[in-house]
């Protein structure tokens, strides 16, 4: 007769690190000692005729065990295999770039440690929620990768990796684990150098606007901008419109950057950059100055006019030009009474980088001379008729500018100069037009002559 | 009749191993447990563990978890123990013994296997 | 593991004498095993599941006990009973003798 040896559970399913209560159970009617094969930890429960009750502790990994017993004089087993599930001790997505090109293609890739059985086990790669692959976990540790091209639509989106232990079969559920999210940066960064506006010139201690801007940037507003004028760096106001980007700043020349300089405008994005540099020359241009040696003069007095500017500056004084750039031009006159109010030119002429810009001065010549009055503009004899209107047109210059009154002689009537006045027959006579200044009299006779008007 | 016969006598260097056999005859080989036992001189026995020629099984005491190997040959219903990284505490008297069951125990002895650990 | 201690360790008796060893054990077991060995030979299977005599042994011997405590008699002394005699159990692995007592002639 065939006896059999029953091992129950059959084939159980149990996590790992659990517990299993094993019975071995013959119906053959024998006492024989029932041993249970197993390299797990075991211990005996309870024993009694053709049967045996151990205990399996932390059981780790799937096992088969077996039972054995005498019988009628040969040995008979049993077995059944223990399945351990174990979920996975680390479930990691790799770091992702710091930057990724749109466009470009990038690999999730994720790592699994421990899991089992691993026939049951599958690792889904996600965006958001989005599964981009699925795929066994199979080696120790499990890598799966996935290939992903990258899209503007992935800034700042979870990548993810779960993993899916499968034990629905057995009853047990679907046990997932997830790793911890890592983002993803996507960019776009044109080839094209951005646009640099500047000035080719830019004068000492004086500022001027700098303009740095790149299109088809993305995400613009996580670009930096460097701008500098040559080692130092401008601070310059940064605004996003779309993909554009645009930085300002204003750039205000040292005098100890005089040359040759560079601006520079620097677009990082991604950990790459874009660069535009434009040649900018920071001259210095001092003057003109005009000088009077005596700014009021004497008539007859000797004056000096000079003009002078920086170094190589060609300086022009009223159309006489100075010996050389640098050097002052220089002219002399004998101060007369036309030359009050004179005002003499310089004009100043400095070549940067292949340019000429001028600058243009001038000083006003005083000359202090006694009053005059001119005959030509006071007519000596005037001849009007009674009762009507005249003006008596007399004008005296001189520096200081003379006070003019004409009086009557031999009285003290005064006529106005300049003003419109009504004629009769009282005002005919001579009379004494003094100019007077505090440097001098000047006296003109001016006779009127009142023609009496025709009685009705 | 039922016979255990056991290899001969062994002289080994410390540090050295040995392996001796136990050849059964008179019954099935793979029906019965075979055990083997260790009496040092003037002592009394030590169990080293048992094997289970049919399935290959093995169940040592923890003390020659690392000294022992047992293992079995169906083909010439032979048993085998190899005894590693000897040191004089293994010189001993190695019995196998054959568990005839419940109403036997060990019933079935070999002569024995003596072991002399020497430099 | 189950510990058997064997007391006496060395005894004598005269022949036609009563022999009583005793086998403790640290907790209790179903059933022992005893076996003789003289010296120069393998030991021999003498008493199975704690009262049953191995084939060839002499009637005079006997064996009892339970739970923890057990123990071999020999009702009359022979000459030929001089020898070691071991208790064994196997109630869990590690399967464990006692020392031994040794049995000698007056």
């Known amino acids: 007769q065939e006896f059999l040896l029953r091992v129950e559970p059959q084939n159980p399913v149990l996590s790992a690190g659990g517990s299993l209560f094993v019975n071995c159970s013959t119906d053959c009617p024998s006492s024989e000692k029932i041993a249970l094969e197993t390299s797990l930890s075991k211990e005996l429960v309870a024993s009694g005729m053709g049967w045996a009750a151990f205990n399996l502790s932390n059981v780790t990994g799937n096992s088969r065990i077996l039972c054995s017993v005498y019988c009628n004089g040969s040995q008979i087993t049993g077995s059944s295999n223990i399945t351990v599930y174990r979920l996975p001790e680390r479930v990691e997505l790799a770091p992702l770039p710091p930057w990724q090109p749109v466009g470009q293609n990038f690999t999730l890739r994720c790592q699994v440690e421990d899991g089992s059985p691993r026939t049951s086990l599958t690792v889904v790669l996600l965006r958001w929620e989005e599964e981009l692959s699925r795929q066994p976990a199979v080696e120790e540790p499990a890598e799966v990768t996935a290939t992903v091209l990258a899209s503007r639509d992935d800034h700042g989106a979870p990548f993810s990796c779960r993993t899916e232990l499968d034990m629905q079969p057995q009853g047990l559920g679907l046990f997932v684990n997830t790793s911890a999210p890592r983002q993803l940066r996507t960019f776009v960064l044109p080839v094209t150098p951005p646009r640099l506006v500047a000035p080719r010139f830019l004068e000492v201690e004086t500022s001027w606007p700098v303009d740095c801007t790149l299109d088809g940037l993305f995400p613009a507003s996580e670009a930096q901008v460097y701008l500098a004028l040559g080692d130092q760096m401008l601070n310059a106001t940064v605004m996003n419109h779309g993909d554009t980007l645009t930085a300002t700043a204003t750039a205000t020349a040292r005098a100890d950057q005089e040359g040759a300089r560079e601006i520079v405008c620097n677009v990082t994005l991604g950990g790459e950059r874009r660069e535009a540099r434009e040649n900018l020359t920071v001259f210095s241009f001092l003057g003109p100055i005009v000088n009077l040696s005596e700014p009021t003069a004497h008539e007859g007095s000797t004056v000096t006019v000079s003009c002078m500017a920086g170094a190589r500056v060609q300086v022009t004084l009223d159309g006489v030009p100075a010996a050389a750039p640098g050097q002052p031009a220089q002219l002399q006159l004998n101060a007369t009474e036309s030359d009050d109010g004179r005002s003499f030119f310089c004009s100043a002429t400095l070549e940067v980088d292949g340019e000429f810009l001028h600058r243009n001065s001038s000083v006003q010549l005083r000359v202090l001379y006694g009053p005059k009055i001119d005959r030509a503009t006071c007519p000596q004899h005037l001849k009007w008729k009674d009762k009507t209107r005249h003006v008596l047109q007399c004008q005296a210059r001189g520096n200081p500018y003379p006070e003019l009154r004409c009086l009557k002689e031999g009285s003290s009537r005064e006529v106005p100069v300049g003003i419109p006045f009504f004629v009769n027959v009282t005002h005919n006579g001579t009379y004494q037009c003094q100019a007077s200044s505090s440097r001098g009299k000047y006296t003109l006779v001016v006779v009127m002559d009142i023609e009496a008007g025709s009685s009705h | 009749q039922v016979q255990l016969q056991q290899s001969g006598a062994e002289l080994a260097d410390p540090g050295a191993s040995v392996k001796m056999s136990c050849k059964a005859s008179?019954?099935?080989?793979?029906?019965?447990?075979m055990h083997w036992v260790k009496q040092r001189p003037g002592q009394g026995l030590e169990w080293i563990g048992y094997?289970?020629?049919?399935?290959?099984?093995?169940e040592y005491n923890q003390r020659f978890q690392d000294k022992a190997t047992l293992t079995a040959d169906k083909s010439s219903s032979t048993a085998y123990m190899q005894l590693s990284s000897l040191t004089s505490e293994d010189s001993a008297v190695y019995y196998c013994?054959?568990?005839?069951?419940?109403?036997?125990?060990?019933?079935?002895w070999g002569q024995g296997t003596s072991v002399t650990v020497s430099s | 593991q189950i510990v058997l201690t064997q007391s006496p360790a060395l005894m004598s008796a005269s022949p036609g004498e009563k022999v009583t060893m005793t086998c403790s054990a640290s907790?209790?077991?179903?059933?022992i095993y005893w076996y003789q060995q003289k010296p120069r030979s393998s030991p021999k299977p003498w008493i199975y599941l704690t009262s049953n005599l191995a084939s060839g042994v002499p009637a005079r011997f006997s064996g009892s006990g339970s739970g923890a405590s057990y123990s071999l008699t020999i009702s009359i002394m022979e000459a030929e009973d001089a020898a070691t005699y071991y208790c064994q159990q196997w109630k869990s692995i590690p399967l464990t003798f006692g020392a031994g007592t040794k049995l000698e002639l007056k």
């Open positions: 008179g019954y099935t080989f793979t029906v019965y447990w």
């Open positions: 094997i289970n020629p049919n399935t290959d099984y093995t």
């Open positions: 907790s209790s077991v179903s059933y």
């Open positions: 013994a054959r568990w005839g069951g419940n109403s036997y125990g060990l019933d079935y």
